[in-house]
Interface confidence: medium
Amino acid sequence: LEVSESPGSIQVARGQPAVLPCTFTTSAALINLNVIWMVTPLSNANQPEQVILYQGGQMFDGAPRFHGRVGFTGTMPATNVSIFINNTQLSDTGTYQCLVNNLPDIGGRNIGVTGLTVLVPPSAPHCQIQGSQDIGSDVILLCSSEEGIPRPTYLWEKLDNTLKLPPTATQDQVQGTVTIRNISALSSGLYQCVASNAIGTSTCLLDLQVISPQPRNIG
């Protein structure tokens, strides 16, 4: 019995279905086929869980969190024992193993390993201004999303005809900050933060209005 090489790792957007491949070759009939799918979750590497089981011509549920979401992609028994996981959750991220036994065919590699990573688009980021908006001051524009896998990067754009930030601005796309030094009336306007990762984009807007000093009345 020989389980074929797996693709190594699979990435899927949260909520989308995932197919975990596992195929094998055997010299024996599939009368005594036994397939166990296990997962070692990334969130709890010390606690492997059973995903689904095929034994004695019957299918059995694994851990409760997979109930109703997991099944074999084809009619069993078969040499393709790939499974699907519907409505993937962040907690489904982990290393999946298919263990295949088909007596009397013993020997060879009977385990296939596939990594599953569930990706999450950035949640709507929060935009805020730090510092005084008085003319001549330094301000920091802050942007962060609570969710996002892979970790989002942040891009600030000024929503005018150029879209580029003023020359006095320095941007940190990892932290989501923009520092604008010595703000002037030209710094005023609508700024957009774009949080993005491999599977999604989300934005927030911020209106920076630079305050000019009020002329003092004399006398």
Partner: antibody
Framework: EVQLVESGGGLVKPGGSLRLSCAAS????????MSWVRQAPGKGLEWVGR??????????DYAAPVKGRFTISRDDSKNTLYLQMNSLKTEDTAVYYC??????????????WGQGTLVTVSS | SYELTQPPSVSVSPGQTASITCSGD??????ASWYQQKPGQSPVLVIY???KRPSGIPERFSGSNSGNTATLTISGTQAEDEADYYC???????????FGGGTKLTVL
Amino acid sequence: EVQLVESGGGLVKPGGSLRLSCAASGFTFSNAWMSWVRQAPGKGLEWVGRIKSKTDGGTTDYAAPVKGRFTISRDDSKNTLYLQMNSLKTEDTAVYYCARVAHGGYSGGLDPWGQGTLVTVSS
Amino acid sequence: SYELTQPPSVSVSPGQTASITCSGDKLGDKYASWYQQKPGQSPVLVIYQDSKRPSGIPERFSGSNSGNTATLTISGTQAEDEADYYCSSTGTAHTLAVFGGGTKLTVL
């Protein structure tokens, strides 16, 4: 894998209408800003229009040559982008591509692109 | 309306450096992107935000943008780089993309 597949192209008479579809997969479509770009036979690329995600207002913008004739819409439940083309002219003949606005709101470029669908306007 | 100008064609020998320019009024104040299109295929983004490379694009592709000119540089050009290249800028907040006329890169 991020994928975009256009359909709905074909031959139409001047003044006629056509609706193109773009089926998206491999990313969270509802979060994405999407765009249409066209390419006349043997010519360069021409931006047609863009639609923002619903969370960003779902607003649309169009290039001057198509404004008032073309309408971009989206059905997030079907992961599908649409281009409704009315009052078609011979100069609208082109391969129409849908593309995702990536790496930033306005400034990140279009990535990926679909395979394109050919629209021929001729009497 | 905003216009971007590219040379119609550029030739380069394999292994040499190819430079494709794109000019427009105060283009350096805007973001520039570059697309590669091979015959019969869809365009592929190779550079965005002036100089950033999407994942999967080889390191030999680089970009710069200042003044009135954006430049796409392909160092150690390979035969597979032969294609049409289009520059694009962000136009305005209501014009997502303005494209140049395209440059045919020939690898001799």
